[in-house]
Interface confidence: low
């Protein structure tokens, strides 16, 4: 290997006596694990990102480096360390021989270490002469500063700043990180550099065509000519904006990263702890008509990430693909024909589509909400944007039979006003990924840190689980769903609401073996019942008769099948009221549903009896969704009974919280 | 005081052209999208099209070919040019300015409309 | 091509009368709809856009409501100055701008 820095001989020498000093060794028993990208043509061997462990000091993560080159060297090998991460994440960017990583791998500190890949601008095509009009633009909510309090942050290509749309309204920072352009014959040619970067900051903030009008925007350019860049360079890029927002902080941030590549874990990493500093990230789900979880950062749960839809509430098809879809996508927007800024000349427009023109819209307004509301967290935004979005509009035969549960139905729209969100007790649904399908094979699904799960249902598309519970991890409730024998594997599905100051634990009753059921309730002062789970040993959950019923007075409590443990989700918070409501089917269905009616949110869905014909429980938007197999397989037998359990529950403590504010 | 005026129209023979022209008075028509409709006697009302505050134009299916949108932002004015005409397309043709961009979701909710002008196809 | 379809077609009622028209989308349109009122010899006047809000000037006695593909325009109480023909309107995209074919609301 060679190295642009000077002379081997030399190298070796500078470091054998830096080595000399560094005798640490990892800690026993902690091996730290590579990493590369699953899409083969996306690699980019030969460049590396070394991870070090969280409390890692800047100080440490430069011996570290030092140690690598050092060590290197002293085998015969040249390495480039290109960059040392502080402020985000701890670690380096080092160029060096693939060789090496079995080395880099046992050095003190190092938690992971990943292989370099590249990211891709996700809208097509790059110019097109068809122009159309807005699919979306701002509804009769616009506040008068239209986002002014707000800056959004581009990561993107270059962008054409004296455009009519965006001129004044984006500062070009001096940040760049993009690899060479590839092809011999490549001419760069301004227009086509700045092309996807100025359409997105448009279709932001721009004049004509913007969501949010005032917004402010900043671009950092991650993405070549071609719309190609790299996760280590829009790691730098997250980093840069971390070390902006520490050295002059202002409002409120939004994060738009139009772009994605194959699953990245430290990709992932840096977008959570950006998050968890109070930025906002958005970005899109990706162009690849698969499942949004295998891409990044789509996949990382503290990003809100956006797949596209068109004006006929169709999935955006792009080419042979189309827009992502799964559960790791958190709402749809527009994204087909979008109209903005073309960078062909100043007051030129052009239509563009894929899923960064939909992450751009819901940036967009991202920044109208969090000016109406600066204090707004990542949580309470994300909330409110699927509580305003409109609901079963998509057309979800487009998607694959077995990602249409787990894919939302939402598309994105501005609130009907700034009042009245505050009093409403915000719930979202949260699916795990797949347990797989062994014997013992578990499911968890997560709430965001500043969420409570309020309940935990499971699913199974073979019926064959042994239900959920609730378990502390870490200090925080997550909600576990457990595979049988024979089962093709479980889903998680976690509730997760916003309720301050909400005091919330699990109360279990096991198994009764008694011909009534088991039982449990909230005995607490003040506690009410949100949810309710049931989880069994026995590998198949026998019918249970006589039916179970929950005995009048005695909303409380939740019941289910003999041979179960019962959980039930007990909070108590100011003001929180909760009510049981049943729909029950006697003869056998595949779908039973129940509701919560206006002003009620839905915390808890559950099935009874439980029996192992039913498929489980799922929540989606306000409504409890029971699934049971196939009827023909059911048979008209007294099985076949369903009944749809959901917990309703309002916040009188925030309704008048509201009221006092208005 | 919000204006538009429609004129052009009067009697034309069948596959004869005519350009209806709509002057804005009290608004900058450049930032707003302007549409064409017409209304056959004792019909209903019936969309031409659009054309959108930087340029394109959009059409009924029936109305493509025949009959061209443009606009002049400087002489605050928007065109419409009908060819080939038939007795079918008599009607009062109205010129309307689009709702403004952060009222409506899409293009096409005309808030301001002119008194129309009639044009009859006949021989 | 999108069809909108309105009934009644004519409707008669008297002063005070609650007043129902219904359009129907031949696709989802979303929210973009909306309602004009017509009088003899004169150009449309918008009373609703996006289904529901109220255009600038109308009076709170009209309503709308709806989404997808069925839509209702209201009117609580009716005025001497509300016999007109009423149109519904989509224009959810430009390739989806059509107009229904109008209620006729007379005097009883």
């Known amino acids: 290997q060679e190295d642009e820095d000077g002379d081997y001989e030399e190298l070796v020498l500078a470091l054998r006596s830096e080595e000399d000093g560094l005798a640490e060794a990892p800690e026993h028993g902690t091996t730290a694990t590579f990493h590369r990208c699953a899409k083969d043509p996306w690699r980019l061997p030969g460049t590396y990102v070394v991870v070090l462990k969280e409390e890692t000091h800047l100080s440490q993560s430069e011996r570290t480096a030092r140690r690598l080159q050092a060590q290197a060297a002293r085998r015969g090998y040249l390495t480039k360390i290109l960059h040392v991460f502080h402020g985000l994440l701890p670690g380096f960017l080092v160029k060096m021989s693939g060789d090496l990583l079995e080395l880099a791998l046992k050095l003190p500190h190092v938690d992971y270490i990943e292989e370099d890949s590249s990211v891709f601008a996700q809208s097509i095509p790059w110019n097109l002469e068809r122009i159309t009009p807005p699919r979306y633009r701002a509804d009769e909510y616009q506040p008068p500063d239209g986002g002014s309090l707000v800056e959004v942050y581009l990561l993107d290509t270059s962008i054409q700043s004296d455009h009519r749309e965006i001129e004044g309204r984006v500062m070009v920072t001096d940040f760049e990180n993009v690899p060479e352009e590839d092809g011999t014959r490549f001419h760069r040619q301004a227009s086509k550099c700045d092309s996807h970067g100025t359409h997105l900051a448009g279709v932001v903030s721009g004049r004509d065509a913007g969501v949010a009008k005032g917004a402010s925007m900043r671009s950092l350019r991650v993405l070549n000519c071609q719309g190609k860049g790299t996760v280590s360079g829009t790691l730098i890029g997250l980093e840069f904006i971390r070390k902006s927002q520490l050295v002059q902080p202002v409002g409120p941030l939004v994060v738009l990263l139009p772009l994605a590549g194959g699953y990245s874990r430290v990709l992932n990493a840096a977008c959570q702890r950006l998050a968890r500093a109070g930025v906002v990230l958005v970005t899109a789900a990706g162009n690849f008509r698969d499942d949004a979880c295998l891409y990044s950062p789509a996949s990382a749960p503290e990003v809100i990430t956006v797949g596209a839809t068109n004006a006929q509430d169709q999935p955006v098809t792009l080419g042979t693909l189309g827009t992502n879809f799964g559960r790791c996508v958190d709402l749809f927007a527009p994204g087909e024909d979008i109209i903005g800024a073309s960078s062909d000349c100043s007051t030129c427009f052009v239509s563009q589509s894929g899923t960064s023109q939909a992450a751009a819209h819901v940036a967009g307004i991202a920044a109208m909400m969090l000016s109406a509301e600066p204090e707004l967290t990542l949580a309470e935004l994300r909330q409110r944007l699927i509580h305003f979005s409109a609901k079963d509009v998509i057309n979800e035969a487009w998607f694959p039979e077995d990602q249409r549960v787990l894919t939302p139905n939402l598309v994105a729209a501005l609130p009907p006003s700034t009042h009245g969100a505050g009093w409403q007790l915000f719930c979202r649904t949260v699916w795990s990924a797949h347990s797989g399908p062994t014997r013992m094979a578990t499911a968890v699904a997560r709430c965001a840190p500043d969420e409570e799960l309020l309940s935990c249902s499971s699913f199974s598309r073979s019926g064959k689980r042994r239900g959920e519970r609730m378990e502390a991890q870490g200090g925080k409730l997550v909600c576990r769903a457990h595979n049988a024998f024979g089962g093709e594997g479980v889903y998680a599905i976690a509730r997760c609401c916003l309720l301050p100051q909400a005091n919330c634990s699990v109360h279990t009753a096991p198994p009764a073996e008694a011909s009534m059921g088991t039982r449990v309730h909230c005995h607490q002062q003040g506690h009410v019942l949100t949810g309710c789970s049931s989880h069994w040993e026995v590998e198949d959950l026998g019918t249970h008769k006589p039916p179970v019923l929950r005995p009048r007075g005695q909303p409380n409590q939740c019941v289910g099948h003999r041979e179960a443990s019962i959980h039930a989700s007990c909070c108590h918070a100011p003001g929180l009221e909760c009510k049981v409501k049943e729909h029950g089917i006697p003869a056998p269905q595949e779908q039973v549903t129940v509701a919560c009616e206006e002003g009620w949110t839905l915390t808890g869905c559950s099935a009874l009896p439980g029996t192992s014909h039913v498929l489980g429980a799922y929540a989606v938007d306000n409504t409890c969704v029971v699934r049971s197999r196939d009827v023909s397989t059911t048979g008209s037998t007294s099985e076949g009974a369903v009944t749809a359990v959901a917990i309703c529950c309002r916040s009188r403590h925030l309704a008048q919280a509201s009221q006092e504010l208005q | 005081e919000v204006q538009l005026v429609e004129s052009g129209g009067g009697l034309v023979q069948p596959g004869g052209s005519l350009r209806l022209s709509c002057a804005a008075s009290g608004i900058d028509l450049s930032s707003y999208a302007m549409g064409w409709v017409r209304q056959a006697p004792g019909k209903g009302l019936e969309y031409i099209g659009i054309?959108?505050?930087?340029?394109?134009?959009y059409y009924a299916s029936w109305a493509k070919g025949r009959f061209t949108i443009s606009r002049d932002n400087s002489k605050s004015t928007v065109y419409l040019q009908m060819n080939s005409l038939r007795a079918e397309d008599t009607a009062t043709y109205f010129c309307?300015?689009?709702?403004?961009?952060?009222?409506?979701?899409?293009?096409?909710?005309?808030?301001?409309w002119g008194q129309g002008t009639l044009v009859t196809v006949s021989s | 091509d999108i069809q909108m379809t309105q009934s009644p077609s004519t409707l008669s009622a008297s002063v005070g009368d609650r007043v129902t028209i219904t359009c129907q989308a031949s696709q989802s349109i979303s929210t973009a709809l909306a309602w004009y009122q017509q009088k003899p010899g004169k150009a449309p006047k918008l009373l609703i856009y996006?289904?529901?809000p109220l255009a600038s000037g109308v009076p709170s006695r009209f309503s709308g409501s709806g989404s997808g593909t069925e839509f209702t325009l209201t009117i609580s109480s009716l005025q001497p100055d509300d016999f007109a023909t009423y149109y519904c309107?989509?224009?959810?995209?430009?390739?989806?701008?059509?107009f229904g074919g109008g209620t006729k609301v007379e005097i009883k």
């Open positions: 309107q989509s224009y959810y995209g430009s390739s989806n701008i059509a």
């Open positions: 309307a300015r689009d709702l403004d961009a952060q009222s409506s979701g899409y293009y096409g909710a005309f808030n301001i």
């Open positions: 054309i959108v505050s930087y340029g394109p134009t």
């Open positions: 996006a289904a529901s």
